[in-house]
């Protein structure tokens, strides 16, 4: 790399992928291994992200751009720029400090991540339960009982003893 000749700032001519090296009379030097500069005129190179352990490299670091990580199978990204990987659970479960646990009765989770959420309370909207909830699925609300014409069938709520919403283990 040639010595820069800018009268204003000799570092301004250093391109991306290099830094202006004060130890070498402000010569543009290439970024060292595992570092990068995404813009010109930099006096220091940024540190490349490393994707190790549960992290998997989605995009390699180059001299001008940072690496990007995602998570290995069985894990999903959390946090800014996938700064963390969290264990997947099955649908109908949530991750606790003790591992994956089934959703409690009355709650569901239809994803492999996140927490169990309460079933929708159909009666709050003046509606009835059309399809019962499970650990994996929310209830489906139907028209209010008053909206049903005579003779029309509606789903009868199951007996409490059967713990509705829990699908067979």
């Amino acid at each position: 790399f040639e010595r820069t000749r800018s009268l204003q700032d000799p570092c301004s001519n250093c391109p991306a992928g290099t830094f202006c090296d004060n130890n070498r009379n402000q010569i543009c030097s290439p970024c060292p291994p595992n570092s990068f500069s995404s813009a010109g005129g930099q006096r220091t190179c940024d540190i490349c992200r490393q994707c190790k352990g549960v992290f998997r490299t989605r995009k390699e670091c180059s001299s001008t751009s940072n690496a990007e990580c995602d998570c290995t199978p069985g894990f999903h990204c959390l946090g800014a720029g996938c700064s963390m990987c969290e264990q997947d659970c099955k649908q109908g479960q949530e991750l606790t400090k003790k591992g994956c646990k089934d959703c409690c009765f009355g709650t569901f989770n239809d994803q492999k991540r996140g927490i169990c959420r309460p079933w929708t309370n159909c009666s709050l909207d003046g509606k009835s339960v059309l399809v019962n909830g499970t650990k994996e699925r929310d209830v489906v609300c139907g028209p209010s009982p008053a909206d049903l014409s005579p003779g029309a069938s509606s789903v009868t709520p199951p007996a409490p003893a059967r713990e509705p919403g829990h699908s067979p283990q």
Epitope: Q42, C45, I47, R49, G79, A80, M84
Partner: antibody
Framework: SLEESGGDLVKPGASLTLTCTAS?????????ICWVRQAPGKGLEWIAC????????TYYASWAKGRFTISKTSSTTVTLQMTSLTAADTATYFC????????????WGQGTLVTVSS | ALVMTQTPASVSAAVGGTVTINCQAS??????LAWYQQKPGQPPKLLIF???DLASGVPSRFKGSGSGTEFTLTISGVQCDDAATYYC??????????????FGGGTEVVVK
């Protein structure tokens, strides 16, 4: 570069907001901007970080939670709000930049001095 | 919480000599460790990242090594300009409820 401002002499119990201003790069890039402090004659102590990309995730040292708040206030500024200050908070406060996600700071400001005294 | 223990607190070296500074992490941090140099009235300067990678513009007489819980910074062919306090720092983002990041207590290097 990074430049801190807002340091002052304040009384115990007071609040103070410090500002970290970037020049030569934009906070729209995927960086973490963090605050680190250093009491006179003592070592370095990490306070908090904020991801200045889209999500704005924040992380705090356990002792800083509740009393310190880090925020991105513009495309070139990050602030640190401090409340209920005590003499133990007297220090030079630095902002620093991390691109690795592992608390490795390749760019630092010169620091701003906060003195808490009655 | 992650704790970084740095030894010795102070070390003296002759010009041209070698200085070794040790840093121990309270838990396995892989190679997520950085070394900084700080001179009075100045901010820290990054020397080494990922335990052994040299930062831009740092002379090759600085060498970092180690992984897991034991790390070392070695300065070979010490120069007068190396008189400063050196800090190790380990850490990583884990979760919003449990974030780890810590500096060692520092090692003052005196050059005779």
């Amino acid at each position: 570069s990074l430049e801190e401002s807002g340091g002052d002499l304040v009384k115990p119990g007071a609040s103070l907001t410090l500002t970290c201003t970037a020049s030569g790069f934009s906070f729209s890039s995927n960086y973490w901007i963090c605050w680190v402090r250093q009491a006179p004659g003592k070592g370095l102590e990490w306070i908090a970080c904020i991801y200045v990309g889209s999500s704005g995730d924040t992380y705090y040292a356990s002792w800083a939670k509740g009393r310190f708040t880090i925020s991105k206030t513009s495309s070139t500024t990050v602030t640190l709000q401090m409340t209920s200050l005590t003499a133990a908070d007297t220090a030079t406060y630095f902002c620093a930049r991390d691109s690795s996600s592992y608390y490795m700071f390749n760019l630092w400001g010169q620091g701003t001095l906060v003195t808490v005294s009655s | 919480a992650l704790v970084m223990t740095q030894t010795p607190a102070s070390v003296s070296a002759a010009v041209g000599g070698t200085v070794t500074i040790n840093c121990q992490a309270s838990e396995d941090i892989d190679t997520y460790l950085a070394w900084y140099q700080q001179k009075p009235g100045q901010p820290p300067k990054l020397l080494i990242f990922y335990a052994s990678d040299l930062a831009s513009g740092v002379p090759s007489r600085f060498k970092g090594s180690g992984s897991g819980t034991e790390f070392t910074l070695t300065i070979s062919g010490v120069q007068c300009d190396d008189a400063a306090t050196y800090y190790c720092q380990g850490g990583y983002y884990t979760s919003s409820a449990d974030t780890r990041g810590a500096f060692g207590g520092g090692t003052e290097v005196v050059v005779k």
